[in-house]
Amino acid sequence: EVEKTACPSGKKAREIDESLIFYKKWELEACVDAALLATQMDRVNAIPFTYEQLDVLKHKLDELYPQGYPESVIQHLGYLFLKMSPEDIRKWNVTSLETLKALLEVNKGHEMSPQVATLIDRFVKGRGQLDKDTLDTLTAFYPGYLCSLSPEELSSVPPSSIWAVRPQDLDTCDPRQLDVLYPKARLAFQNMNGSEYFVKIQSFLGGAPTEDLKALSQQNVSMDLATFMKLRTDAVLPLTVAEVQKLLGPHVEGLKAEERHRPVRDWILRQRQDDLDTLGLGLQGGIPNGYLVLDLSMQEALS
């Protein structure tokens, strides 16, 4: 807490400028009017104040706005934003995307801090959903943002926002997240033609069910192995050898290199060796000829 001391004669700040960097902490406290600071916040970021001096300026703003800063001040916080605690940020009502961008810019290139996480949470909750412009902004600053959300939070993403998602934004998503995003992507891209549709939906296919994979296999899509390896195992298992061959097209040869890894390994165990042999890849581990295949899951469903 900075002690209240009178401002020395001639040192009263008439504007926020570089002369203030040579003020001691107590002089800043005594000589800078909080209302002046609030109206000239846009200047603060350009002035080389120390962390300690920024603490004094923050303290002045806290006294002026005990219920939380107005957006006109928040938008110009600049580096002072990094001095805010999540508790401070929870008092704010940030509605402008420009304000969000300005604060994210301060943190650009760094991992998401607790302050940024709180800011984003406040902003998204205030908007009620993750609209396209917001998602565009957030993924531009934090490509992993989408995958940091819970499946429940992702359910508030409208299909129209999916257009803002880039393949790299989904790199760290797990299957539960893709389960939520895939139906939204399918809906968003439904009016596109075959090849264009596949380009857009490809990144989301980790959430695709078997029937959609079967449908894709009829469209000459030539799925690459990297995408195939990210598919849900339970969605791949029911596919026939012919369907996988059509799905992968020329990339089918890559199955040999992946035969020990999921989902390829599990899929091989479910296929007849005869059928696997038709691929000419030397895949081993299929069901030997003459063996009867019992679908236990179907048997359980009937009993």
Partner: antibody, heavy 117, light 107 residues
Framework: QVQLVESGGGLVKPGGSLRLSCAAS????????MSWIRQTPGKCLEWVSY????????YYVDSVKGRFTISRDNAKNSLYLQMNSLRAEDTAVYYC??????????WGQGTLVTVSS | EIQMTQSPSSVSASVGDRVTITCRAS??????LAWYQQKPGKAPKLLIY???GLQSGVPSRFSGSGSGTDFTLTISSLQPEDFATYYC?????????FGCGTKVEIK
């Protein structure tokens, strides 16, 4: 007076790990941001990482992201740098410094880290 | 990131001389510049902050000036203890970056 004393340097093989420590005294450690800065054999200085006074904000230079971890223990007036997957190019004298944002106003004496097979 | 270029890389001078070292930033940094002195085997020591602010305890013969991209460190009358390497550093944008030093040697 302000004093910063680094320790933990030494010779390590590529891929190895080291943990550097910095003991602070003479000022209220918990009030200050702290940084690690290194000086390569060519004598150039390179900022490595910083941590805010509470430890809630942490930044790294791109070349060490995912390999180095900065931390602090305000109760012990200590700053740490955990260095994993070390490379030959990490060879340097490592300094801890008090970070006042506009400059690094106090530095330790440094600890030498040599990464070589 | 912002590149800091110091010139000259070394300078030979005598006690009593006026010595000027320059530092150029690859883009404008306002007055977010610091100067440090380093002697062999020792840690760097802060001399100047915010381009022209003299750090407490530093002799007044040291002064800094400049703004934007071009900065100068001046030693008005070189003393025997001033023979050292001097570094500039920008704090305007992340990450902080340093010049590679100017060595002040005895002529």
């Amino acid at each position: 007076q302000v004093q910063l004393v680094e320790s933990g340097g030494g010779l390590v093989k590529p891929g190895g790990s080291l943990r550097l420590s910095c003991a602070a005294s003479g000022f209220t450690f918990s009030d200050h941001y702290m940084s690690w800065i290194r000086q390569t054999p060519g004598k150039c200085l390179e900022w490595v990482s910083y941590i805010s006074s509470s430890g809630s904000t942490i930044y790294y230079v791109d070349s060490v992201k995912g390999r180095f971890t900065i931390s602090r223990d305000n109760a012990k007036n200590s700053l740490y740098l955990q260095m994993n997957s070390l490379r030959a190019e990490d060879t340097a004298v490592y300094y801890c410094a008090r970070d006042v944002r506009t400059a690094f106003d106090y530095w330790g004496q440094g600890t030498l880290v040599t990464v070589s097979s | 990131e912002i590149q800091m270029t110091q010139s000259p890389s070394s300078v030979s001078a005598s006690v009593g001389d006026r010595v000027t070292i320059t530092c150029r930033a690859s883009q404008g940094i306002s007055s977010w510049l610091a100067w440090y002195q380093q002697k062999p085997g020792k840690a760097p020591k802060l001399l100047i902050y915010a381009a022209s602010g003299l750090q407490s305890g530093v002799p007044s013969r040291f002064s800094g000036s400049g703004s934007g991209t071009d900065f100068t460190l001046t030693i008005s009358s070189l003393q025997p203890e001033d023979f050292a390497t001097y570094y500039c550093q920008q704090a305007n944008s992340f990450p902080p970056t340093f010049g590679c030093g100017t060595k002040v040697e005895i002529k």
